[in-house]
């Protein structure tokens, strides 16, 4: 068989995956007492089941909805920070800021942070050579179809003040193709979510600009408008103060702008 | 079951065209990147054209860039490649695939000949 059929445009799987997902079970549901009755052997079967032996461009959310229902965690959903584009910065704010959450704070997000992996139609192998990629292949892969489900997930758990961490060195701010913008957004429940509030991150040392006024800030202040959701927007002008301030909140320097 | 109908082959002189169709059944067509390929007599397959499942992207071989052009229905379940400025290199059977699935149609034959 030439070698060509089974090559995908995206990196295969990332190696030693059964191994890291397991370890990351363990070590996760080690450190939150709230996941201890968690099974890792049951998960990591139940993972392994959503895309193993299935042709990777044909994965539904149902595939995964074993794996979600062992996953199954509850945050306080007043406390959810969503990002796009910018996941370092969310993920070093939660490590301070302990009482909010990303995606990537869950059981489900930690156990697929940054892993690549799919399978082969009819064999029960692991693909380590080569993954579908999401625009040159297809959409339907066991990665992208694992993110929209927990994302769809999280953001349907989402209350009150939700927040979301928006990268303001980008072309668009607001991507309305990222996940956040096609997925989170709109799952959002306006019977349950106040306001969106987003926080624009600047990139420059003396960018000074408001970027709460940029059109894709304006456009997702519209698509959340139209949910009946409110919606507000901060300039972060320096990301490193505002994650000291967060560190420090009684720093004299903190209670000017950041 | 999976099944795969090519078409549209046929005899053709140096410098002319054709379109080849191949439609697909017992799957969810728009799911699948597609690709075709091509046998020429005495010789292996090989690689001529790949799309993704939505149509968006699109691959060549470098023997046929900017001669071919491959496109896809997914209302229709259908693939096509569209063949301009034929050369008798091109002669051979032409199959079209589903990425990552064994099954194979019956092919169709492209004659380049005056």
């Known amino acids: 068989v030439p070698r060509w059929r089974q090559q995908w445009s995206g990196p295969g799987t990332t190696k030693r995956f059964p191994e890291t997902v397991l370890a990351r079970c363990v070590k996760y549901t080690e450190i939150h007492p709230e996941m201890r009755h968690v099974d890792c052997q049951s998960v990591w079967d139940a993972f392994k089941g959503a895309f193993i032996s299935k042709h990777p461009c044909n994965i539904t959310e149902e595939d995964y909805q074993p794996l979600m229902k062992l996953g199954t965690q509850t945050v306080p959903c007043n406390k959810i920070l969503l990002w796009s584009r910018i996941k370092d910065l969310a993920h070093q704010f939660t490590q301070v800021q302990r009482d909010m959450f990303t995606l990537e704070d869950t059981l489900l997000g930690y156990l697929a942070d940054d892993l690549t992996w799919c399978g082969e139609f009819n064999t029960s192998k692991i693909n380590y050579q080569s993954c579908p990629d999401w625009r040159k292949d297809c959409s339907n892969n066991p990665v992208s179809v694992f993110w929209k489900t927990v994302s769809r997930r999280f953001a349907e758990a989402a209350c009150d003040v939700v927040h979301v961490m928006l990268n303001g060195s980008r072309s668009k701010i607001f991507d309305k193709n990222s996940t956040f913008g096609s997925v989170e957004v709109h799952n959002l429940q306006p019977e349950k979510v106040q306001t969106l509030e987003a926080w624009v991150i600047h990139g420059g040392r003396e960018d000074s600009r408001d970027l709460c006024q940029d059109p894709t800030i304006k456009e997702l202040e519209s698509i959340i408008s139209k949910r009946n959701i409110q919606f507000s927007c901060k300039n972060i002008y320096r990301p490193d103060k505002f994650l000291q301030c967060v560190k420090n909140p009684e720093d004299s320097s903190c209670t000017s702008e950041i | 079951d999976v099944q795969l109908v090519e078409s549209g082959g046929g005899l053709v002189q140096p410098g002319g065209s054709l379109r080849l169709s191949c439609v697909a059944s017992?799957?969810?067509?728009?799911?699948?990147?597609m690709m075709w390929v091509r046998q020429a007599p005495g010789k292996g397959l090989e690689w001529v054209s790949r799309?993704?499942?939505?149509?968006?992207?699109?691959n060549y071989d470098d023997s046929v860039k900017g001669r071919f052009t491959i496109s896809r229905d997914n209302a229709k379940n259908t693939l096509y490649l569209q063949m301009n400025s034929l050369t008798p290199e091109d002669t051979a059977v032409y199959y079209c695939r589903i990425l990552g699935l064994p099954t194979t149609g019956q092919g169709t034959q492209v004659t380049v000949s005056s």
């Open positions: 017992g799957l969810t067509f728009s799911s699948y990147p």
């Open positions: 799309i993704s499942d939505s149509g968006g992207y699109t």
